[in-house]
């Protein structure tokens, strides 16, 4: 039972940490212009991934996409690489953890199956958490070393009469939610890890028969062997690595004693 | 059509109140902001206040503390509630709409003039 | 608060020939997310309200005729009428529609020579 739920809490945690990465990936504020002891302007500029935009007083929002490719800076090439491969990641991770859960029973896929592909989820959660976490994170330094570098020249006179305010720019909404959502993701990720290993059955010497209780089409298996159903052709014993007696509805699982993680 | 018609000028002592109104018709107050500038007489323009279409105001040094803008949506109109008034704000007042997009006022009402004297 | 500047205080020109209009802020109105600049100009004739002639620094209000454009950015911006006719004889006033508060420039008078 509680692998079953830590896989599925897993699951959930990784869900909502990747919408978050998909949402702060298509988010426009991952930058905005710093307010603090700035002249008030009316006129409000905020940047994302694919677009700047600015907001004026009257309400109007103007969006203009990077419409670029070779022009745009290589950080900024650099973090989109890592929050799509980071989407791509995670989306491969829930589809495949999709069939890796305990309480989703498709066709006679064995216990060994679903902790492979729950291994394989967890991994995958775990980079797209860290990709994402990484994109975020060089955007934020990006941002505090040209924010410094702006406030160091930020006024440039001429001639002592005339200045230009330099735009500063701070964190955007979009840095906080991509963190917390590579937060969840990369914790989800580690849950299906942990519950990887109570999925993955002992491995044992012995070999066991599989005895076919009489009206009942379900074969009990008291060893190293996998019960199936009287449904479909599936009647070969099929060799697991499963450490007691167990029905294939039973939620109870044992620790493994392979690492996986 | 845009228009927009100012009352409530008159004769005031230094001191005293004053409330200005502006009826706005042809636009809705949600969508476009308001402004309330004014001019000494003989002399240049000077921008009071603004009501943002959200509610939001921003105010003219000379003024802040002492002058309020406000709105009534159902209305459709604009205020200017002016207190501790001095000679130097003897001027004819005006609204007028922001157009939206870059900043700029682009339809005004023909004013109303605020006489500060003793 | 932004200072601005115009100049000359006061123009005569003869009819059909081009006047020009400086102003100079002393902030730059260059929005550096759109590349655009928040002035516009205005025209007041005696006894009149004021008339937005153009906004954002070069574009021109719908029904102000072709002979008036605006130019400039950042600090410094003109405004020219290319051929002064009887009705161009006001006041014309630019102002800063970037920083608060919107600050007016303090006018400049063409009269016809």
């Known amino acids: 039972m509680a692998v079953t739920a830590c896989q599925g809490l897993g699951f959930v945690v990784s869900l909502i940490g990747i919408a978050g990465i998909i949402a702060a990936t298509c988010m426009d504020q991952w930058s905005t212009q710093d307010l603090y002891n700035n002249p008030v302007t009316a006129v409000f500029n905020y940047q994302g991934l694919w677009r700047s935009c600015v907001r004026e007083s009257s309400g109007f929002t103007e969006c203009r996409g990077y419409f670029t490719l070779l022009g745009l800076p290589a950080m900024l090439q650099a973090v989109r690489a890592l929050m799509i491969v980071g989407i791509v990641l995670g989306a491969i991770g829930l589809l495949v953890s999709i069939f890796a859960l305990k309480c989703i029973r498709i066709g006679s896929m064995e216990d060994s199956a679903k902790a492979n592909m729950t291994l394989t989820s967890g991994i995958m959660f775990i980079v797209s958490g860290l990709c994402a976490i990484a994109g975020v994170s060089v955007f934020a330094n990006m941002l505090v070393t040209n924010f410094w570098m702006s406030t160091a020249n930020m006024y440039t006179g001429m001639g002592g009469m005339v200045q230009t305010v330099q735009t500063r720019y701070t964190f955007g909404a979009a840095l906080f939610v991509g963190w917390v959502a590579g937060g969840l993701t990369l914790i989800g990720g580690v849950m299906m890890c942990i519950a990887c290993r109570g999925l993955a059955p002992e491995e044992t010497n012995y070999k066991a028969v599989s005895y076919h209780a009489s009206g009942h089409s379900v074969a009990y298996k008291p060893g190293g062997f996998k019960a199936s159903t009287g449904f479909g052709s599936n009647t070969k014993n099929k060799k697991i690595y499963d450490g007691g007696a167990r029905t294939e509805d039973e939620v109870q699982s044992y620790p493994s004693k392979h690492d996986y993680v | 059509q845009v228009q927009l018609v100012e009352s409530g000028g008159g004769v005031v002592q230094p001191g005293r109140s004053l409330r200005l109104s502006c009826a706005a018709s042809g636009f809705t107050l949600t969508s476009y902001g308001v402004y309330w500038v004014r001019q000494a007489p003989g002399k240049g323009l000077e921008w009071v206040a603004v009501?943002?279409?959200?509610?939001?105001?921003n105010y003219a040094d000379s003024v802040k503390g002492r002058f309020t803008i406000s709105k009534d949506n159902s209305k459709s109109t604009l205020y200017l509630q002016m207190n501790s008034l001095r000679a130097e704000d003897t001027a004819v007042y005006y609204c007028?709409?922001?157009?939206?997009?870059?900043?700029?006022?682009?339809?005004w009402g023909q004013g109303t003039l605020v006489t500060v004297s003793s | 608060d932004i200072v601005m500047t115009q100049s000359p205080d006061s123009l005569a020109v003869s009819l059909g020939e081009r006047a020009t209009i400086n102003c100079k802020s002393s902030q730059s109105l260059l929005n550096s997310g759109n590349q655009k600049n928040y002035l516009a100009w205005y025209q007041q004739k005696p006894g009149q309200p004021p008339k937005l002639l153009i906004y954002g620094a070069s574009t021109r209000e719908s029904g102000v005729p072709d002979r008036f454009s605006g130019s400039g950015s950042g600090t410094d911006f003109t405004l020219t009428i290319s051929s002064l006719q009887a009705e161009d004889v006001a006041v014309y006033y630019c102002?800063?529609?970037?920083?608060?508060?919107?600050?007016f420039g303090q006018g400049t008078k063409v009269e016809i020579k």
């Open positions: 009501v943002w279409a959200g509610g939001n105001t």
């Open positions: 102002q800063n529609d970037y920083f608060f508060p919107f600050t």
């Open positions: 007028a709409r922001d157009r939206g997009r870059l900043l700029a006022m682009d339809y």
